[in-house]
Every structure is written in C-alpha cells, then in structure tokens.
C-alpha cells in the first residue's frame, strides 16, 4: 500500500507541458529554461467506496508546492481550480474528498483525468495552447483530454 505521493511529469499529445503562472496551470510548448511543474499524485485510500471500472481515483497536486487540483461549480459550470492544500491531508481524510478526486484512466500511453465530483467532466487544455487547464464535457477537437503521464522514480 503506497502512502506517499508519487511524482510524475505530464504533457499532452502536442508535447505541451503544464506550467504554473500566477497560481494558474497553463499548457505551453516545452522550451529551454522552462520549468514544467512536477505532479504529485496519490490514490484515494477509500477506493472501495467509489465507482468501480471508471479509473483509479487519485488526488492530484503540484509537487513541493502545497497546491492541489480541485473541481468546484462557478454558477452552473464546473471549473478546475488550484487550492492551497497538502495532498496527504486529503489522502488521510476519513472519507473521499470528491472535489479533489479524479478518476485516472490509462489507454496505452494516454491518460485521462475525470472529475469524481462532476462525472463526465475531464481535465483538458484548449487545442490552441498557452491556455489555462479547464474542465470539459466535450471530448472533441477543440480540447485535448488525453495526456502523457510519466512517473518519476
């Protein structure tokens, strides 16, 4: 049983990486002297209380930065936010903290991250690039929901 977060790096199919800019995650083409974020992820320890066959429920944070990804409604729209939160505090909670949880599914080298709080909504980046990460229901050409996750050991 793993009870420390794993670290990983993420890029999309267009080789864009996640960068932290003004407390917002954006996807940009990888360049020299750029510092992509390192992701911290840990599986929910209450996996038996969540939906089966939807993916591995994980908490997603930014390694070393005490920031975690969460989903919350703004008006009627689920949005992706970064919150100041220790990922291990989420992990240790007596119940799944759904707003911070994502179903991680892998198909070959591609990973998707679906909100547990808002089923059917996925972490995405606009195909244009240089844009903030968002949540989307539309798995079409306008947004990329497939990411490459490389674990760092």
């Amino acid at each position: 049983k793993i009870d420390t977060p794993q670290r990983g790096s993420i890029q999309d199919i267009n080789h864009r990486v996640w960068v932290l800019q003004d407390q917002t995650l954006i996807a940009v083409p990888r360049k020299d002297r750029m510092s992509p974020v390192t992701i911290a992820l840990i599986s929910c320890r209450h996996v038996e209380t969540l939906e089966k066959d939807r993916g591995n429920p994980i908490y997603l944070g930014l390694n070393g930065l005490n920031l975690c990804l969460m989903c919350a409604k703004v008006g009627d729209q689920p949005t992706l936010q970064l919150k100041e939160k220790d990922i291990m505090d989420l992990y240790n909670q007596p119940e799944p903290v759904k707003s911070f949880l994502f179903y991680h599914s892998q198909s070959g080298r591609n990973s998707t991250f679906e909100s547990v709080a808002f089923p059917g909504w996925f972490i995405a980046v606009s195909s244009e690039g240089g844009c903030p990460l968002i949540l989307t229901q539309e798995l079409g050409k306008a947004n990329t929901t497939d990411f490459g996750l490389t674990m760092l050991f």
């Epitope: 038996e48 969540l50 939906e51 505090d89 909670q93 007596p94 119940e95």
Partner: antibody, heavy 121, light 109 residues
Amino acid sequence: QVQLVQSGAEVKKPGASVKVSCKASGFNIKDTYIYWVRQAPGQGLEWIGRIDPAIGTTRYDPKFQGKATLTTDTSTSTAYLELSSLRSEDTAVYYCARYDYSGSSFYFDYWGQGTLVTVSS
Amino acid sequence: QAVVTQEPSLTVSPGGTVTLTCRSSTGAVTTSNYANWVQEKPGQLFTGLIGGTNDRAPGVPARFSGSLLGGKAALTLSGAQPEDEADYFCALWYSNHLVFGGGTKLTVL
C-alpha cells in the same frame, strides 16, 4: 435553507422491519454523505452507517451489517434507513445527518429531528 | 471494537473555562482519529461543532476549540455562556468506522 426532515414515529412488533426516511432540502443530496446514528433511551449515540447518495456506496458499523440497509432516491432527495428483524433493543431515536467537507475537514453540520422507533409486543 | 469514553457530567460558571475530553480504549487519540464534536441542546437539533480534531465548523463561535490533550481528544469552551448548557458528544474514526462517546452533560451554573 438546509434541512433534513425525517418521517414520523413508528411502533413495530419484534421480528418486523421498519423504513425511516430523511428528506433533504436546500442542497444537492448528491454533493455530500448522509450518516445514520441512533440513540437508545438514556444512552449515547451509536453510528449505524453512511451512504454516498451520488453513487449509492455504503459503509456500516460491523454491528449493523445485515441489520441496517441504507438507500437513497436522488430524484426525491430522500435517504432511507431500513432495519430488519427488529428486537426490543432496537428501540431508539434514529437520526440522519449530513457529513460534509468544508475546506479542511468533514463535519456533521446538519441533522434531522430524529425518528423514534419503538419495538414492543 | 473500540470504546470511547467521556465525562458523564461537568459544571462550569458563566464566563468560565471548561474542557471536555474523549478517551479511546485502544490507546492515545491522534489526529488520525479525526475527532468530531457535536452539541445537543434540549428541544433543538444536534449541531456539529468540530471536525478533524481542531477545525471549527462554519458558524461555530470561537469560544469552542478542539485539540489533543494528554492522549485524549478535547473540546475546550472558553467564556461559557448560559446557552452553552447542552449535551456534547465526541466521535472518533477507527479506519473505516466511526465510534461515538456516551456524551457529557454540561451545566452552566
């Protein structure tokens, strides 16, 4: 405003079953966990179990496994507790409560008014 | 299964300070037990006071605080008011299940 309104008092014979309801209003029942707790006369509180209304998954105190069944009907925002094979020791006030995450921790923030179940021959 | 024990009754003077405790039969209470405290006033609904050992629920007066004290979970009431007269219950998490204490009847006299 947030409210949990429970069904009325019940009198049952030993061996019978009872189903207590808890109707939620002022919030989306699928956004939280509903807990069930009981208080026998002159006793403390006893946790029965909880349900995640969004997906229907449950947890029970080992003592109530097989005795209690938790369900929800999200279309009517109602949670249910069904107790089977009732005995006199099941005479108690049964409460539903919302167990919600608010920024840093889970809290029991709202409770139903309680439903008295009396088991008597 | 674990047994959670509270003082059956305590008395505090108005404006005074009192500490209610919650002991576990399995040993010292830790932050991993995520202590919760709830209040029941006569004729009123239960209300949550504390979650996660020391996090006050939204809207709860600052005179209520949660902590760990000598291997027990503690609820401290500083500057007791007459309206704080009530029954107080703690609950501790043990892995995947929750155990309540027997409750403390607090009198403000």
